[in-house]
């Protein structure tokens, strides 16, 4: 719970708590902003981002944005508040523990975005939804 000696007035978003009243700690995300990428035509890719940051705000989640146009492919990794749109899109999957890419309509490019809320979850971006159940370890759990 919020320690009594920690100041909690001044403004509303000073201290974010969960439903149990525990202080919500921020998560860790890959945070390389926009980088060129070789990720193409794969079921999943690693971000190849070497920077892991503590998100600035406890409510922020991890986001990855994959874009392909005639010139290049880029991968963007950031922290972002799911209450706010990113690249004009709502982060619908912010509560997901995995970063499952979903295609968004953007003129002149192929645009995929995912968001997730577990530590460094935007390090592994997944383009195939079946990928989750084709994981042998997961199948082992399911059939045990």
């Amino acid at each position: 719970t919020i320690p009594p000696h920690v100041q909690k007035s001044v403004n509303n978003d000073m201290i974010v708590t969960d439903n149990n009243g525990a202080v919500k700690f921020p998560q860790l995300c890959k945070f390389c902003d926009v980088r060129f990428s070789t990720c193409d035509n794969q079921k999943s890719c690693m971000s190849n981002c070497s920077i892991t940051s503590i998100c600035e705000k406890p409510q922020e989640v991890c986001v990855a944005v994959w874009r392909k146009n005639d010139e290049n492919i880029t991968l963007e990794t950031v922290c972002h508040d799911p209450k706010l749109p990113y690249h004009d899109f709502i982060l619908e999957d912010a509560a997901s523990p995995k970063c499952i890419m979903k295609e968004k309509k953007k003129p002149g490019e192929t645009f995929f975005m995912c968001s997730c809320s577990s530590d460094e979850c935007n390090d592994n971006i997944i383009f195939s939804e079946e990928y989750n159940t084709s994981n042998p370890d997961l199948l082992l759990v399911i059939f045990q």
Epitope: T1, D18, N19, N20, A22, V23, F25, L28, I54, S117
Partner: nanobody, 122 residues
Framework: EVQLLESGGGLVQPGGSLRLSCAAS???????QMWWVRQAPGKGLEFIS?????????YYADSVKGRFTISRDNSKNTLYLQMNSLRAEDTAVYYC???????????????WGQGTLVTVSS
Amino acid sequence: EVQLLESGGGLVQPGGSLRLSCAASGFTFGTEQMWWVRQAPGKGLEFISRIDSPGGRTYYADSVKGRFTISRDNSKNTLYLQMNSLRAEDTAVYYCAKRRPTGVSGTFYDYWGQGTLVTVSS
């Protein structure tokens, strides 16, 4: 009973250094994820550094990266924060905190020390 006791704060000039300590008791320190969190006057909490266990991986907020170093001595049940190249904007009460999952998805218990005041001023 879980106790966290910070020390090492004080007045320091810009560009100076300080080392904060957090003495832990009442739990198995060596297995816990530990944090340093600060609160500047009239501001919200800023989570500046985390150290995991086992493995001791460390993480930092952008605001302190390259200047602050978190470490732990499990044999002494103590968490440290080495602060170099201090700036006026580092003035805050510094808390050590521990967090662990409750077993219920997405919820955590957290414990906090009383804090130690760091003032950076010439």
